[in-house]
Amino acid sequence: AVNGTSQFTCFYNSRANISCVWSQDGALQDTSCQVHAWPDRRRWNQTCELLPVSQASWACNLILGAPDSQKLTTVDIVTLRVLCREGVRWRVMAIQDFKPFENLRLMAPISLQVVHVETHRCNISWEISQASHYFERHLEFEARTLSPGHTWEEAPLLTLKQKQEWICLETLTPDTQYEFQVRVKPLQGEFTTWSPWSQPLAFRTKPAALGKDT
């Protein structure tokens, strides 16, 4: 049995994935739970098994089709339900009418690489993954660089207000190890949020030439 409040949050990656997190304050005994997606105007429906991510929250990914297929539009409404097994039947624990393009969170950027590195500068590029063609080039990015002795939270955010899949980091210290991350967000959607941060890219600036004033 379940008591307490629950929170059920889902995001659409703009192509063929809806990721959901269900949080439940009360005690949940060993039971099987799943998310069920039922679109109002599509012939398919989809289910995923909720797996624990912490003591009181569970997550799963609804895979709607091939990663780059456009499975939903702005007029789709998907009824999302959390169902938990109670004996021989399923009990509805949470429900929402989900508007995919009001609840966007893109996949984290991928394929980060150092294009060119110098003593004080580093040019880095990346790619976006599974972003809808509807956005065309209209995306924004945030980037951050981890310097020695600092935390990610202390790193200043660099904002790129257009679909620019590269950055030139300046005023770096020679012969120093850095890490870099980037995230992406579309312009559309009342509840749209930033993608997760990319996997960090580690790089090292070149040492200053001997005998030269730096």
Epitope: R41, Q70, T73, H133, Y134, F135, R137
Partner: nanobody, 119 residues
Framework: QVQLVESGGGLVQTGGSLRLSCAVS????????MGWYRQVPGKQRELVAD???????KYADSVKGRFSILRDSVKNTVYLQMSSLKPEDTGIYYC?????????????WGQGTQVTVSS
Amino acid sequence: QVQLVESGGGLVQTGGSLRLSCAVSGSRFISDVMGWYRQVPGKQRELVADMADGGSAKYADSVKGRFSILRDSVKNTVYLQMSSLKPEDTGIYYCKAGLWIAGRHSDYWGQGTQVTVSS
């Protein structure tokens, strides 16, 4: 500037047929849904039929089996084939297009075309 141009309305007898068409033109856009709504005096505009990307069509219960919607994504045109028309199908038929422009989605409407079904 986006423009929706409707055509094909007119006066027809009960049991007759009409074909409406609506073409979208103008600035750079991507359409993800196009459809038809109708309005009768004293009532709100209501969905007749629409078609979203992926070929997903939606029809009002009152027109199922009589009307069919066809969308040509290359020409950015939507058609409504209306058959077995009834007097209660009379109204102003409006075309609606959901368009992505510069990364944001908005709905655009045509001026409307009158359909009158006489008994």
